[in-house]
């Protein structure tokens, strides 16, 4: 009498008293084992010498002993092993060659749910097909930003595939990038193709200078074409200035003859001078410079009736060499909020920094930074990181200056400044922040995460969750519950609703009781080891209405894991067609009582269900 | 995406006059100053007039005051210098700008004024 096959596999989950049933019913003919099983056995694999084959926990061995494992070895492991070896890589930042990536990448059968845990340049090798859906691939791509793109040459399969989907993903239509589009992208704006540069020059040529390798022939022609027509960032080249060349640098092989030939020479000629003398200038890594103030005239006396009294409109007209003689850097520093009002080149702005940093070198007192409005934009992080700001009106008027623009590095930093300063994220702050950036909140580590009053929770919106992780949602959550505790039940759900990702089982039971009809959008984003012990009535219960929409996503985690869970039956009195559960008559033996029994994690993830015939005893009296 | 056009460039003899044209498209309402700025070669970029957009209150080097006039067309989306009694010196790139509060945030290509004596 032939059998189903055992599912899922018990990898390192098998007790001694689980393994001998295994053993009786193999034995007995009565379960046949699954090819990943005998692999893991020897029965079908070639036998495992190696460290990974029989560790009792794969997160116990060393990075020594991770580090150089053959492809050979992982391709006989079951692919909760796998997905359990990449977890101990990534936890202690064991670096990989390409080759064992791409071995990883392709026992990981099914795509992995938690990518974070996941060792960042693995996410390369992965097929961005199998992240479809917005929130998927988006938290795909948020990874791939931070991956190496360049482990993987510019024509490799991997790389060529991950452009077009990211693009797909963002939601970028034609060829017009915003800035927030390239941040976005990451290393893989390097690879966009010729017509992204001619029409997203302003946003897109500031990121291909700090680019590794050299750009083809079709990015080279576009950027060369959008430096001699002069436009933004950085206009035409009879306008270039030595920290334009600066700014440029990584560019500057693109130029050619026609742009050399308009850019003043005597800029050319003290650039040439400074890089000859600077052997830095000559290191191809180096990324894109800040341009800082360079005195490209004689210190002059100011000349007579040119003087400034006051901040006023007469100064646009004055030269860079003006502007360091006749304005006074105390009157500047008194009349800033002048100065804001006031259109100023940026090679004039450069100046005015300048006089500012001599003013003050150990940093800029709170009633300058409060109104430096563009001048801002000029500042390194280096200079931020002097600063001591205290006020929440100098955070706005700051933040304002950029807004409409992805978080840049001088914003962060005045973030980390402010925020350090305050020695919490408070709720005022927090309905700053967030309101300038929705996604701050989901930036910040689980443990920054844990100095939010629950307090500040009420300054939270939904959208503002949109891109964190489970884990953050993890620490989230219970501040969520604590902050809304005393409201009523629909209100109540409202408010919680975007932090459920963090919730557990017994919150998710408790709220199946209050006539929510959660919708399938937060259903999916539920945590799938929260979702798992749920039964079909407590199921339908939360979801109500939209119980309905869960034939739609059956393919799909948690909904999938669920299904695999419960019993044909009960799947069947919802009407709607979803299969995979559980045929009648058979028997569950639920092995996460393994982990009570010997205090060992089961590494296969939540609740292994072995399915065996009830009729067992039955048969065997036969 | 705004872009600015200048035209109406060209060579004339000193004394002699020219309109400068510059045509603005894209979101462009948003920017409270716009102006003309001029470079010769070898020469840095300098300010030669320029119009608060909010009282259209304008503002002249003083290399020009008395001889050039900065003016727009708000409905066509244009910016116009009148330039008279034009002299050698003026001879330049032309470029026209629009800015906010702050910083000058976008140029057009240039137009060649070339003043013969």
């Known amino acids: 009498m032939a059998l189903p096959t055992a599912r899922p596999l018990l990898g390192s989950c098998g007790t001694p008293a689980l393994g001998s049933l295994l053993f009786l019913l193999f034995s007995l003919g009565w379960v046949q084992p699954s090819r990943t099983l005998a692999g893991e056995t020897g029965q079908e694999a070639a036998p495992l010498d190696g460290v990974l084959a029989n560790p009792p926990n794969i997160s116990s061995l060393s990075p020594r002993q991770l580090l150089g494992f053959p492809c050979a070895e992982v391709s006989g492991l079951s692919t909760e092993r796998v997905r359990e070896l990449a977890v101990a890589l990534a936890q202690k930042n064991v670096k990989l060659s390409t080759e064992q990536l791409r071995c990883l990448a392709h026992r990981l059968s099914e795509p992995p749910e938690d990518l974070d845990a996941l060792p960042l340049d693995l996410l390369l090798f992965l097929n961005p097909d199998a992240f479809s859906g917005p929130q998927a691939c988006t938290r795909f791509f948020s990874r791939i930003t931070k991956a190496n793109v360049d482990l993987l040459p510019r024509g490799a399969p991997e790389r060529q595939r991950l452009l077009p989907a990211a693009l797909a993903c963002w939601g970028v239509r034609g060829s017009l990038l915003s800035e927030a589009d390239v941040r976005a992208l990451g290393g893989l704006a390097c690879d966009l193709p010729g017509r992204f540069v001619a029409e997203s020059a302003e946003v897109l040529l500031p990121r291909l200078v700090s680019c590794p390798g050299p750009l083809d022939q079709d990015q080279q022609e576009a950027a060369r074409a959008a430096l001699q027509g002069g436009g933004p960032p950085y206009g035409p080249p009879s306008t270039w200035s030595v920290s334009t060349m600066d700014a440029l640098r990584g560019l500057l092989p693109v130029l050619g003859q026609p742009i050399i030939r308009s850019i003043p020479q005597g800029i050319v000629a003290a650039w040439r001078q400074r890089s000859s003398r600077d052997p830095s200038w000559r290191q191809p890594e180096r990324t894109i410079l800040r341009p800082r103030f360079r005195r490209e005239v004689e210190k002059t006396a100011c000349p007579s009736g040119k003087k400034a009294r006051e901040i006023d409109e007469s100064l646009i007209f004055y030269k860079k060499w003006e502007l360091e003689a006749c304005v006074d850097a105390a009157l500047l520093a008194t009349q800033m909020d002048r100065v804001n009002a006031i259109p100023f080149t940026y090679e004039q702005l450069d100046v005015l920094k300048h006089k500012l940093d001599e003013l003050y070198p150990q940093g800029y007192p709170e009633s300058v930074i409060q109104h430096l409005g563009y001048l801002f934009l000029k500042m390194s992080p280096e200079d931020i990181r002097k600063w001591n700001v205290t006020s929440l009106e100098t955070l706005k008027a700051l933040l304002e200056v950029n807004k409409g623009h992805e978080m840049s590095p001088q914003v962060a930093t005045l973030i980390d400044r402010f925020v350090k300063g305050r020695g919490q994220l408070d709720k005022d702050t927090l309905d700053t922040l967030t309101a300038f950036y929705p996604g701050y909140l989901c930036s910040l580590s689980p443990e920054e995460l844990s100095s939010v009053p629950p307090s500040s929770i009420w300054a939270v919106r939904p959208q503002d969750l949109d891109t964190c992780d489970p884990r953050q949602l993890d620490v989230l959550y219970p501040k969520a519950r604590l902050a809304f505790q005393n409201m009523n039940g629909s209100e109540y759900f409202v408010k919680i609703q975007s932090f459920l990702g963090g919730a557990p089982t017994e919150d998710l039971k408790a709220l199946s009781q209050q006539n929510v009809s959660m919708d399938l959008a937060t259903f999916m984003k539920l945590r799938t080891d929260a979702v798992l012990p749920l039964t079909v009535a407590e199921v339908q219960k939360l979801l109500g209405p939209h119980v309905e929409g869960l034939k739609a996503e059956e393919r799909h985690r948690p909904v999938r894991d669920w299904i695999l869970r419960q019993r044909q039956d009960d799947l069947d009195t919802l009407g709607l067609g979803l299969q995979g559960g559980i045929p009648n008559g058979y028997l569950v033996l639920d092995l996460s009582m393994q982990e009570a029994l010997s205090g060992t994690p089961c590494l296969l993830g939540p609740g292994p269900v072995l399915t065996v015939l009830a009729l067992l005893l039955a048969s065997t009296l036969a | 995406q705004v872009k600015l056009e200048e035209s109406g460039g060209g060579s004339v003899q000193a004394g002699g006059s020219l309109r400068l044209s510059c045509t603005t498209s894209?979101?462009?309402?948003?920017y409270k100053w716009m102006g003309w700025f001029r470079q010769a070669p070898g020469q840095e970029r300098e300010g030669?007039?320029?119009?608060?957009?909010?009282?259209?209150?304008?503002y002249y080097s003083d290399s020009v005051k008395g001889r050039f006039t900065i003016s727009r067309d708000n409905a066509k989306n244009m910016i116009y210098l009148d330039m008279t009694r034009l002299r050698p010196e003026d001879s330049a790139v032309y470029e026209c700008?629009?800015?906010?509060?702050?910083?000058?945030?976008?140029w057009g290509q240039g137009t060649q004024v070339t003043v013969s004596s």
């Open positions: 030669v007039a320029v119009i608060y957009t909010g009282n259209d209150r304008t």
């Open positions: 894209g979101y462009t309402n948003s």
């Open positions: 700008a629009i800015g906010h509060d702050g910083a000058w945030r976008y």
